[in-house]
Interface confidence: low
């Protein structure tokens, strides 16, 4: 058969503070008649009584003395055994013995009191893992609460009060005595490694004690940047080295990714080597990865290269070129970096001009030929393929040549050839005699065989192509008599 008591097993306080001991009981019989509070009670077998310092002794009727005393019994005669010690002293540490007597029964209930010289620190409880931007609750727990000694728990981050509203709760129950402050907090990556302090203060804000923890905030790599290590500018064909840098990462970075993907060398972690960099390698981005990957903004390689795809393009006229036309040739290229370029036109190794266009006000057949243009920038120069300029013109420089000569003996053979310069070549010949009578011959050669004296005279030819016609000057053929004819005469 026991008396039933409920109260915290041990209470904690410090010199100058107070203790409030919530306590309930149920006596075995009737009401309480006597109550004595002992400090470190010891049972004396000789006297069958308890010895020890008496902190409080009730009067026989169980009434509480009205005057304020350091130790107060705030209970009653049947169920409440709450106690208050204010102020509490270091030497109050030890056992408190509640000696309860009813009419017929007695009981000694022991409660442990732990009084420290200085205010003991609270204890910060953190979740097992903290991730950035995920709200967590920081808990600061102090195994102390007392009505007569208001305290406050203040949160500091790196020594500066945290502005988030903390919820402070106190428990002064038979189950537990504590003060707890809970702070809902969304940590940022920049809080990683920072010191959070829970500071115990008295009602006036005076520092009493504290507990500190270092925040371990899991976060992806932060402020990731792709850095070009090469001196600028980068030229096509150079070997380019890039590094992937970051400001903070928790856990540590274990790998890196690069885009676009290429058959590139990674000589060390976070370093990329691009050999023989292409002119079209525009941007590169890297990611630093721990449990997460964080991508940097792409960095422009800004590769410089000689002009590309240089070609000659006829821009005027749109159709074929006829002698006398105005002609414009354009030196085109697809791209160049740097953009500033120079042009050079060349025909048969001879420099013709330094503009992007080559212009002929009135083209002549002599301008026909193989043309090239060159485009150069500070990186290099690029030549076009040779481009053939073809000039179409009517037959010109026509002449009649005679074989074997312009004096032929009758009976022999004489061949008249219409020689000309034309583009396209002469497609049709017409022969005329000294009377401007057209002859029934339309090939380039007019063969007279056997030649007669009557054939003597001036001949001319006309050549025709798709562009036009041209005529030769007169050429005279002299046919003389043979010795036989002269002999007959």
């Amino acid at each position: 058969s026991k008396w039933v008591f409920e109260h915290p097993e041990t209470l904690y306080a410090w010199e100058g503070a107070c203790v409030w001991i919530p306590c309930t009981y149920r006596a075995l019989d009737g009401d309480l008649e006597s109550f004595i509070l002992f400090h470190n009670p010891e049972y004396n077998k000789n006297t069958s009584k308890f010895d020890g310092t008496r902190l409080y002794e009730s009067t026989k009727d169980g009434k509480v003395p009205s005057e304020q005393k350091r130790v107060q019994f705030l209970g009653d005669k049947n169920k409440n055994c709450t106690l208050s010690i204010h102020p509490v002293h270091l030497n109050d540490s030890g056992q408190l013995g509640l000696r309860m007597e009813s009419k017929t029964e007695k009981w000694m209930e022991r409660i442990h009191l732990n009084v420290s010289e200085r205010p003991f620190p609270p204890h910060i409880q953190l979740p097992p893992e903290i991730q950035e931007s995920q709200e967590v609750t920081l808990t600061c727990l102090l195994n102390f609460s007392c009505y007569g000694y208001p305290i406050q728990l203040q949160w500091l981050l790196e020594g500066v009060p945290m502005r988030q509203a903390a919820v402070t709760s106190t428990s002064l129950t038979i189950k537990s005595v504590f003060t707890r402050s809970e702070l809902k907090f969304s940590p940022q990556w920049s809080h990683h490694g920072k010191i959070v302090t829970c500071q115990l203060q008295d009602a006036d804000g005076k520092f009493l004690s504290n507990d500190t923890v270092q925040l371990n905030v899991k976060h992806p790599p932060k402020k990731v940047t792709t850095v070009i290590q090469n001196p600028m500018p980068i030229r096509e064909g150079d070997t380019v080295t890039l590094s992937c840098n970051y400001n903070s990462s928790n856990p540590s970075v274990t790998r890196y990714e690069w885009k676009p993907h290429g058959a590139w060398e990674e000589p060390s972690l976070g370093v990329l080597k691009i050999q023989n960099v292409g002119w079209d390698n525009t941007t590169i981005a890297c990611a630093a990865c721990n449990s997460w990957c964080s991508w940097a903004s792409p960095v422009a390689l800004n590769v410089q290269y000689a002009p590309r795809d240089v070609r000659v393009r006829k821009i005027k006229p749109l159709s074929e070129i006829h002698s006398g036309n105005s002609v414009s040739l354009q030196c085109d290229f697809s791209s160049s970096h740097p953009k500033e370029v120079q042009f050079f036109w060349e025909k048969n190794g001879r420099l013709l001009g330094k503009e992007s266009q080559l212009n002929f006000d009135s083209i002549s057949p002599e301008d026909a030929g193989s043309y090239s243009c060159w485009v150069n920038n500070s990186i290099g120069q690029t030549a076009s393929k040779a481009w053939t300029l073809e000039v179409l013109y009517a037959p010109r420089r026509l002449r009649v040549s005679m074989s074997p000569g312009d004096q032929v003996m009758e009976g022999k053979s004489a061949t008249l050839t219409c020689e000309s310069d034309a583009n396209p070549p002469v497609s049709h010949y017409t022969w005329f005699d000294w009377n401007n009578q057209s002859l029934p011959y339309h090939s380039q050669k007019l063969r007279l065989e056997p030649v007669k004296v009557q054939h003597s005279g001036a001949y001319w030819c006309q050549g025709t192509n798709s562009v036009g016609k041209g005529r030769s000057p007169l050429s005279t053929l002299t046919v003389y008599y043979s010795p036989e004819t002269i002999g007959r005469r």
Partner: antibody, heavy 120, light 112 residues
Framework: QVQLQQSGPELVKPGASVKISCKAS????????MNWVKQRPGQGREWIGR????????NYSGKFKGKATLTADKSSSTAYMQLSSLTSVDSAVYFC?????????????WGAGTTVTVSS | DILMTQTPLSLPVSLGDQASISCRSS???????????LEWYLQKPGQSPKLLIY???NRFSGVPDRFSGSGSGTDFTLKISRVEAEDLGVYYC?????????FGGGTKVEIK
Amino acid sequence: QVQLQQSGPELVKPGASVKISCKASGYEFSRSWMNWVKQRPGQGREWIGRIYPGDGDTNYSGKFKGKATLTADKSSSTAYMQLSSLTSVDSAVYFCARDGSSWDWYFDVWGAGTTVTVSS
Amino acid sequence: DILMTQTPLSLPVSLGDQASISCRSSQSIVHSNGNTFLEWYLQKPGQSPKLLIYKVSNRFSGVPDRFSGSGSGTDFTLKISRVEAEDLGVYYCFQGSQFPYTFGGGTKVEIK
């Protein structure tokens, strides 16, 4: 003991700005909010805003945003309030007041007030 | 903004009388942390204000016990059990629970 020493009276022209000060002593300046209050004769009192000198954080009454700018200099334990584009309605006594407790929040110590008169 | 309405505007009293000042807020001034930051200040002519009561009913240190505060939610009262000459001046209620903080219009306690 805790004291707040405010700067002397100011006579300023309309459209001008004025900067008044409040020097704190007797406590850790950076650890208490400093509030500013406006009092016009017969008009009651208005809370302007507050500053936390520890990190310069501020809260303003919407009515005084753009009108008042609160700053603090930890090295000299001095809080400042600058009032801009002054008009006659800005003529008032301005008090600084400390939030005395981070537990109970009350204005336990006040400055003596600075009189600002706006007149051409 | 929370409007703090004080009544009466003027309160003529005889020394030794009980005085009661009412302060009503336009909405609840219970702070999210559960506290009600309602304060009472006394301002005497030519002086800066003095704190009397904080958190509705707590007397500030050095304030005589003839001053008491009560109320909850939106209705609050300051009582002076026996008015003394040094109690004359303008009394202001103040809410520090929600931004912007606001004062009541003031009640002038003067001799009849």
